[in-house]
């Protein structure tokens, strides 16, 4: 008996071939001997089976001695043995219909779990293997679970169902809802405008929800909500914003915030959360602000940074085109009695400059100039 695997909701074509290459009488029946369809001359006739409105054939093949049974919009309960009767012969085909579905929405938040459930006909014992977009293989029986979804899990999951040495392939598109970056750092000189961007790692037709940016300034004892906003069909509207700092927010995606001035009291880290409509849980992105200030007071040239810097970062003070006068893994460095010239304060990581501030030291009889 020939075995054919089908997919729920799909179309399957069961073949039946006569030895004579001409149109002759045929009919298809199910295992209960109920007629599904057949022909009368060059016309299709249908029986009283439950497949009535979903069964069809191809007249164009009849002349070649081929009498297919097409079943559209397959259901699990269509799994059965189908019998083709032609030329006093009987051809049997066993059809097994499988369905594979994500038991939750296919749009999942980063860190959530994905469960795939296999629907199969009674008496079948299929095995399932799924391959994620990043090439990770998972195997299982009736259910497959993947916990802690990551951004790289977004895309098409290809699942193969194996039964009787035959296979049927399912493709399920999964969208992991997350920000493109989990964390980012912005380095700014005091007084500069600061731009924070929170690009999403997915695109959907309609995006609705609400969000908030909480800020923990390095100098403050507790965190504070800087801004709250709503998102409606990808349009951003501010609900509430603090007076200090007075943040501005872009009206369109990607989420974009502007801080008019980088000041030491703002240096610190923030957490932007986004709650999406009809989703449990929130998307998070951490953002950090490091602010640099270079000053000269009397005979002391000082460079300071505020905000979350890693211990391996180097802070240096150097006269232009000369070796660094002072270089430390600290958040403040100074030079006493600096000679005249253009001094550079540099924050660097393994030789790569992250932030630079210049200050002009004038001869001792004049006042310093900060460009």
């Amino acid at each position: 008996k020939k075995v054919v695997l089908g997919k729920k909701g799909d179309t399957v074509e069961l073949t039946c071939t006569a030895s004579q290459k001409k149109s002759i009488q045929f009919h298809w029946k199910n295992s209960n001997q109920i007629k599904i369809l057949g022909n009368q001359g060059s016309f299709l006739t249908k029986g009283p089976s439950k497949l009535n409105d979903r069964a069809d054939s191809r007249r164009s093949l009849w002349d070649q001695g081929n009498f297919p049974l097409i079943i559209k919009n397959l259901k699990i309960e269509d799994s059965d043995t189908y019998i083709c009767e032609v030329e006093d012969q009987k051809e049997e085909v066993q059809l097994l219909v499988f369905g594979l579905t994500a038991n939750s929405d296919t749009h999942l938040l980063q860190g959530q779990s994905l469960t795939l459930t296999l629907e199969s006909p009674p008496g079948s014992s299929p095995s399932v293997q799924c391959r994620s977009p990043r090439g990770k293989n998972i195997q299982g029986g009736k259910t497959l679970s993947v916990s802690q979804l990551e951004l790289q899990d977004s895309g098409t999951w290809t699942c193969t169902v194996l039964q009787n040495q035959k296979k049927v392939e399912f493709k399920i598109d999964i969208v992991v809802l997350a920000f493109q970056k989990a964390s980012s750092i912005v380095y700014k000189k005091e007084g500069e405008q600061v731009e924070f961007s929170f690009p999403l790692a997915f695109t959907v037709e309609k995006l609705t929800g609400s969000g908030e940016l909480w800020w923990q300034a390095e100098r403050a004892s507790s965190s504070k909500s800087w801004i709250t906003f709503d998102l409606k069909n990808k349009e951003v509207s501010v609900k509430r914003v603090t007076q200090d700092p007075k943040l501005q927010m872009g009206k369109k995606l990607p989420l974009h915030l502007t801080l008019p001035q980088a000041l030491p009291q703002y240096a610190g880290s923030g957490n932007l959360t986004l709650a999406l409509e009809a989703k449990t849980g929130k998307l998070h992105q951490e953002v950090n602000l490091v602010v640099m200030r270079a000053t000269q007071l009397q005979k002391n040239l000082t460079c300071e940074v505020w905000g979350p810097t890693s211990p391996k970062l180097m802070l240096s003070l150097k006269l232009e085109n000369k070796e660094a006068k002072v270089s430390k893994r600290e958040k403040a460095v100074w030079v006493l009695n600096p000679e005249a010239g253009m001094w550079q304060c540099l924050l660097s990581d393994s030789g790569q400059v992250l932030l630079e501030s210049n200050i002009k030291v004038l001869p001792t009889w004049s006042t310093p100039v900060q460009p």
Epitope: K7, D10, T11, E13, F43, L44, D56, S57, R59, I70
Partner: antibody
Framework: QVQLVQSGAEVKKPGASVKVSCKAS????????IHWVRQAPGQGLEWMGW????????HYAQKFQGRVTMTRDTSTSTVYMELSSLRSEDTAVYYC??????????????WGQGTLVTVSS | DIQMTQSPSSLSASVGDRVTITCRAS??????LAWYQQKPGKAPKLLIY???TLQSGVPSRFSGSGSGTDFTLTISSLQPEDFATYYC?????????FGQGTRLEIK
Amino acid sequence: QVQLVQSGAEVKKPGASVKVSCKASGHTFTSYYIHWVRQAPGQGLEWMGWINPNNGGTHYAQKFQGRVTMTRDTSTSTVYMELSSLRSEDTAVYYCARDMVRDSAEYFQHWGQGTLVTVSS
Amino acid sequence: DIQMTQSPSSLSASVGDRVTITCRASEDISTYLAWYQQKPGKAPKLLIYAASTLQSGVPSRFSGSGSGTDFTLTISSLQPEDFATYYCQQSHTIPWTFGQGTRLEIK
């Protein structure tokens, strides 16, 4: 949604062969026959044949028998139509189309965007 | 091969007009007939199949009738987007054949 995306325009010399591809998406590739239909400039439509992507079975119009070959690659959900011994009258836009079957008859429900094949010396 | 003949081969009409295109088969094809619309530089689009069944998504101003050898496509009230070329096609016997087309132009 069902999409059939065809390969780009080709210019060929008489006597040469051309191979046009048609990549299907949005449906189970092996479940529907793909037909090829051509249209000469300013002319009507002409059916060339079909391929059953499930088993690779083909049926060609008598007119193209011996000159046309239809193949498929299930791993990429792509169907190919190769026409050999090209002549100037083969200059046409070649379309692939996915059929639908209703009451045992076949109709062309979804079409590719077409591929212009120009045969010129 | 079954020959399909359309008439007229071209037709001028105005928005709001009722238009009828006919298609004749060289032999009985029962109701195994389809109508397609094609706009310049585009692929054909299935409008009607089985002589009178409207394909999903096609406006109800399009209708088809006939059986045997004579068929008609009617557009009850022409819209600007309906100006195109229309083809009939028989699905009775291989090779499937098309009519030569009817070009519908704005008057």
